[in-house]
Every structure is written in structure tokens, then in C-alpha cells.
């Protein structure tokens, strides 16, 4: 996981701060007992902002120690600061917990930029604004880190919600969500509604604001409109999916669909941007540039280096295209599309020097590790991680930022052939052939 472009901190306001809250539409599929309905105690349990991550409050140990924990669907370790650090307001003090058990094993996690390392143990963990359960979970107590914690952030750890295959040091370390499902009656599913603010938030606004919801064990009707559409989880490691087509303002990028998933496509709440493989990024930028050519933006804007600004309240959203990703559907030869607006891929940035204007950063960037559907995508949708049925659901988020002319959309079905060919098969090192 590339910590450099990956998130770490906080998000917008609940509801539809700037944007019109969409009306409820008709009911979707038949009810599934225990899997949907109202989860009032979990609604609005996330805070943060898209540029620095979304966090949930958790308690660890006995007596409970409260920590803010970054919600990350792109990793699989539950890891918390466990030693003083200049950027941490508080940290997990194992010696104060009567239920802490040392696993006498270390863990080291390097990123492209930076790293964290620590000691493995288990302890009792609960989520105050989550299901009313306590579980014994693996915890990596971070004792040393470099470029991991963020100055001025409000979180002290990370909750990796992906699968055991990518857990460190190896896949024998059971991730938190697996422990939760095994030890309780919580269904094997969670859903995320990340609410981008649509405008920059200062520190005090962030701390006082709501950033969305993590519904553990179910689906909350109030958080989305229209229907939920599901795409298969291709492989249980990251939350890997298959993109079969990409359109900019309805114009097909016309690339071999393997390029869209080279070397994988994942849904990752721990990444800010929509990250695209080099070739796809270049084609997408070319197309977005062409669509928005009524204004001349600096090259640095497309690189994420320069901001673009407009006089407050005059952002010309209409000159920017919508972006549609077609995802493999659950039925053979059927796909559906998710469509985001510039309100999702232009990220509001507060800059004192230009405070009289509304300024934005282009939040689509280049990747060397495949497509990453980060907060930029997720802020448009209510995303259901249905692990039990090995699928991810998308519906239009009730809190997504939009204008009076366009909204994000989830639409289908579309007929798409040979979708299996769109998946890239990462070459596996056959260790059995290595000399020992």
C-alpha cells in the first residue's frame, strides 16, 4: 500500500452539506433478515475529511482506552500507536490493560514512503458507536514509525478491513473483522458512507463535524437512494473488482479493458484519490482536458501540483465531465456503471493565500499498482462490503455533493461480453521451483 498517496486523517459534514439530499426512491430487492434496516447507533460514527482519511472511535483494553482509528479497506492489520510520538495526542498503553496478551512476535510494515513496526498482541476491542459487542482481536502495537502518523491529525491507529491474505507479517494473523464475525453474531458484512464536505474544513470544523458512517453487520436504508448494484469480489485479498469500461462524459476511452485493471483494481477507503494505471490516467486526463477546454488549466493542475481557483461560489462545475466506471455485474455478460461528478474528483482545498476564492486540487492521479477507487469514488456512493456473498455493492450516497443539474449515479444493467478477460492475472512466483 503506498502510504505516500494513501490517506491518513478526517472528513466532511453529515447529510448533504452543500448538496441537495436526494429523495428516497422505491424499494430495491426483498429484505434479507438481519442484514438491512436501521442502524441508528452507527450512523454518523465517522469523522474526517477525504484528503486525510476517515476515522472511527474504538476502545482497546480493560479498562477501555479510547482511540480514533483510521478506517482502511486497503490493508488488513489493526495497528495502533503504543508509544509516545510527537504527532499523537494519546496512545495505547498495554501495561494499563489487564486483558492484554503478548504474542511475543514483531511486525514490520514498510510503505513506498515510510514504515511502521511494532509488537503483536491481543486485547479486548469494541466500537462504541458500533455493534454492542466486545471481541478479542489481534493488535499491532506500533512502537516505532516513520512518515506514518500525521502531524495535526486526530487518529492514533489504523483498522485494516481487507482480508488475511495481505495481513502482516503473514496471512495467519487474523484481521479484526474476521475475529468480530467469528466471535459474535454480527453478519459478515459492513458498509461505508463517506461524506465529502464539498468545501474545505478547518481543524475545529473537522473535529466538530460528521464524516459519514460505517455500518457494521448491515445496510442502512437511510444512507442511499435508488438501488444497490453488486460487483463480484474477484479475489479475497484487497477488495479487488473488475472494471470493464470507462467513459468520460459518455465517451468511451476505448482501451483494452485489461488496462483498467493492470495490475488490479481495488476499493480502498485509505486512499484519497482515484488512482489509475499510467496509460489509463493519460487517456483519461486527455479526455477530461478536451471536455473542459473552455478554460486553460496549467499542466501542474493535472499533476495535482497546482490548485485552480474561482471567485467564491462561481466554480464552473458544468465545464467538467462526469466519469463513469463500468463494473462487472453479478450476472453473466451484465455490467453496471457508477458515475462521479467533478464535485467528487475536484477536491476542495483551503489555502490562506487564496482564501477569498474556492480552490481545488485534481484528485485523480497516476498509479503503478493498478486502479485504486479511493475516497474520490467512495464519497459519491454508499458502498457495501458484502464479504458473506463475496461482492461489493454501490448505491448513490444520500450525502454526496452535487448541484441542481447532475448527481452521481449507479445505473444498469448493460450488456458487456467477455468481462472475465478484463482481469489481469498477476504472475505468481512459484516458490516450489526455488532451490533451498
Amino acid at each position: 500500500t503506498q502510504h505516500g498517496i494513501r490517506l491518513p486523517l478526517r472528513s466532511g459534514l453529515g447529510g448533504a452539506p452543500l448538496g441537495l439530499r436526494l429523495p428516497r426512491e422505491t424499494d430495491e430487492e426483498p429484505e434479507e433478515p438481519g442484514r438491512r434496516g436501521s442502524f441508528v447507533e452507527m450512523v454518523d460514527n465517522l469523522r474526517g475529511k477525504s484528503g486525510q482519511g476517515y476515522y472511527v472511535e474504538m476502545t482497546v483494553g480493560s479498562p477501555p482506552q479510547t482511540l480514533n482509528i483510521l478506517v482502511d479497506t486497503g490493508s488488513s492489520n489493526f495497528a495502533v500507536g503504543a508509544a509516545p510520538h510527537p504527532f499523537l495526542h494519546r496512545y495505547y498503553q498495554r501495561q494499563l490493560s489487564s486483558t492484554y496478551r503478548d504474542l511475543r512476535k514483531g511486525v514490520y510494515v514498510p510503505y513506498t514512503q515510510g514504515k511502521w513496526e511494532g509488537e503483536l498482541g491481543t486485547d479486548l476491542v469494541s466500537i462504541p458507536h458500533g455493534p454492542n459487542v466486545t471481541v478479542r482481536a489481534n493488535i499491532a502495537a506500533i512502537t516505532e514509525s516513520d512518515k506514518f502518523f500525521i502531524n495535526g491529525s486526530n487518529w492514533e491507529g489504523i483498522l485494516g478491513l481487507a482480508y488475511a491474505e495481505i495481513a502482516r507479517p503473514d496471512d495467519s494473523l487474523e484481521p479484526f473483522f474476521d475475529s468480530l464475525v467469528k466471535q459474535t453474531h454480527v453478519p459478515n458484512l459492513f458498509s461505508l458512507q463517506l461524506c465529502g464536505a464539498g468545501f474545505p474544513l478547518n481543524q475545529s470544523e473537522v473535529l466538530a463535524s460528521v464524516g459519514g458512517s460505517m455500518i457494521i453487520g448491515g445496510i442502512d436504508h437511510s444512507l442511499y437512494t435508488g438501488s444497490l448494484w453488486y460487483t463480484p469480489i474477484r479475489r479475497e485479498w484487497y477488495y479487488e473488482v473488475i472494471i470493464v469500461r470507462v467513459e468520460i462524459n459518455g465517451q468511451d476511452l476505448k482501451m483494452d479493458c485489461k488496462e483498467y485493471n493492470y495490475d488490479k483494481s481495488i476499493v480502498d477507503s485509505g486512499t484519497t484519490n482515484l488512482r489509475l494505471p499510467k496509460k489509463v490516467f493519460e487517456a483519461a486526463v486527455k479526455s477530461i482536458k478536451a471536455a473542459s477546454s473552455t478554460e486553460k488549466f496549467p499542466d501542474g493542475f493535472w499533476l495535482g501540483e497546482q490548485l485552480v481557483c474561482w471567485q467564491a461560489g462561481t466554480t464552473p462545475w458544468n465545464i467538467f465531465p462526469v466519469i463513469s466506471l463500468y463494473l462487472m455485474g453479478e450476472v453473466t455478460n451484465q455490467s453496471f456503471r457508477i458515475t462521479i461528478l467533478p464535485q467528487q474528483y475536484l477536491r476542495p482545498v483551503e489555502d490562506v493565500a487564496t482564501s477569498q476564492d474556492d480552490c481545488y486540487k485534481f484528485a485523480i492521479s497516476q498509479s503503478s499498482t493498478g486502479t485504486v477507487m479511493g475516497a474520490v469514488i467512495m464519497e459519491g456512493f454508499y458502498v457495501v462490503f458484502d464479504r458473506a456473498r463475496k461482492r461489493i455493492g454501490f448505491a448513490v450516497s444520500a450525502c454526496h455533493v452535487h448541484d441542481e443539474f447532475r448527481t452521481a449515479a449507479v445505473e444498469g444493467p448493460f450488456v458487456t461480453l467477455d468481462m472475465e478477460d478484463c482481469g489481469y492475472n498477476i504472475p505468481q512466483t512459484d516458490e516450489s521451483t526455488l532451490m533451498t
Epitope: 486553460k296 490548485l307 485552480v308 489555502d351 487564496t354
Partner: antibody, heavy 116, light 107 residues
Framework: EIQLQQSGTELVRPGTSVKLSCKAS????????MHWVKQRPGQGLEWIGM????????NYNQNFKGKATLTVDTSSGTAYMQLSSLTSEDSAVYYC?????????WGQGTTVTVSS | DIVMTQSQKFMSKSVGDTVSVTCKAS??????VAWYQQKSGQSPKSLIY???HRYSGVPDRFTGSGSGTDFTLTISNVQSEDLADYFC?????????FGGGTRLEIK
């Protein structure tokens, strides 16, 4: 308050290297790119290159490739520029400047004098 | 590389006058031009971005205009503290380039 605090004056020998620093404060360091600009005595401004602190991606002016190397330390919020194989042509004031729209914030500058 | 030309190297004005500093780009840079003021022995100070937007805290005596290839910084009601070098910069494409500067002297 946003500040870019640069390291002090350097008097260096020809052929050697020097590493200048620029410590940022008052904003999230990894959110904005850092640029370096050269100004020779009584002359104009020349863009050297830039670095993205979040990914350590760099982009150099062709004229400074091989001369300047840009790095960052995100844990301390500091950007660095190393200048190598110094000659009298490298005697100048070097500024770091933060991205935004153009360069809204500038450091106070570091004077480098190359002399034997 | 885009060349930014400030044809006037020096300008001399009296307090209260209006002065126009011009800058010409060798190719179309849209409105992606900034202006900086540099007083003797100091670092550059940002004045104008996007050709005509004032940075926060810049007095409204400073006005930018232009697009494409021709840009102007106008200082009305010139004050003695405006004694400085003024540089234009294009940030439309890499490498970013600056004009050679115009020195404003106060009579």
C-alpha cells in the same frame, strides 16, 4: 501562520556539494509540492524543480538535472536540495517556495557562495 | 521553454502616479500568470495569481490583467514602499519561467 524557514549562508569550495534545507510549518506538509528557485546576484529568477512530499516524485528543469537533487523528510516537514560539483556559476540565493496557485509562499532564501 | 519578456527593465514614477508593468509570453499561457514583488535583500512576495486575482492581504492598488500572451501589472497611487523589482511568472507548463524583472524607482 505558514512559514518556510531556510538554512543559513553557505561558503563552499568548488567541486564540493552542499545541502540546503527548508523547514515548513503552519500547514500539512504532504499536501503541497515544494519548489526551488535560483537567483544570481542582480539577476532574475530561475526555476530549478519541484518535489511532491507525499510521494517524493520530482520534476526538474532540464538545466538543473545532475546539478540539483530534491528530497524531503515528511516526519520533520523539511525539504532539501543538494547541489553537487559546485562552481562559481552556482553562487546565488536559493529559495524554496510552496505550491498552491503559482508560489504563494517563499522562504527567506539561502545564500551560497562558491569560492576557493 | 516559454520565454517571459519584461521589456522595460526600469521605470521611474512619483508617489501617487499609476504605473503599468508589462510582460509578454512567447506562447499562449491562458491566464496562468503570477506577479511577484521583490524588495532589496528580501525574498519575492506574491502579489497576483491567475493573471488578475490578488493574493490575500495584497492592497487593491495592485491590479493584474491580460490573458494568452500579454499581461499587465498596474500599480495605482504608487507609494514609496512600492520601490522594488517586479517579476512575472508563467505556471502554465514546465519548466516554470520568470520574466527578467522590472525595477520600479520612486522619483
Amino acid at each position: 501562520e505558514i512559514q518556510l524557514q531556510q538554512s543559513g549562508t553557505e561558503l563552499v569550495r568548488p567541486g564540493t556539494s552542499v545541502k540546503l534545507s527548508c523547514k515548513a510549518s503552519g500547514y500539512t506538509f504532504t499536501n503541497y509540492w515544494m519548489h526551488w528557485v535560483k537567483q544570481r546576484p542582480g539577476q532574475g529568477l530561475e526555476w530549478i524543480g519541484m518535489i511532491d512530499p507525499s510521494a517524493a516524485y520530482t520534476n526538474y528543469n532540464q538545466n538543473f538535472k545532475g546539478k540539483a537533487t530534491l528530497t524531503v523528510d515528511t516526519s520533520s516537514g523539511t525539504a532539501y536540495m543538494q547541489l553537487s560539483s559546485l562552481t562559481s556559476e552556482d553562487s546565488a540565493v536559493y529559495y524554496c517556495a510552496r505550491s498552491g496557485v503559482a508560489f504563494p509562499y517563499w522562504g527567506q532564501g539561502t545564500t551560497v557562495t562558491v569560492s576557493s | 521553454d516559454i520565454v517571459m519578456t519584461q521589456s522595460q527593465k526600469f521605470m521611474s514614477k512619483s508617489v501617487g502616479d499609476t504605473v503599468s508593468v508589462t510582460c509578454k509570453a512567447s506562447q499562449d499561457v491562458g491566464r496562468n500568470v503570477a506577479w511577484y514583488q521583490q524588495k532589496s535583500g528580501q525574498s519575492p512576495k506574491s502579489l497576483i495569481y491567475s493573471a488578475s486575482h490578488r493574493y490575500s492581504g495584497v492592497p487593491d492598488r495592485f491590479t493584474g490583467s491580460g490573458s494568452g500572451t500579454d499581461f499587465t501589472l498596474t500599480i495605482s497611487n504608487v507609494q514609496s514602499e512600492d520601490l522594488a523589482d517586479y517579476f512575472c511568472q508563467q505556471y502554465n507548463s514546465y519548466p516554470y519561467t520568470f520574466g527578467g524583472g522590472t525595477r520600479l524607482e520612486i522619483k
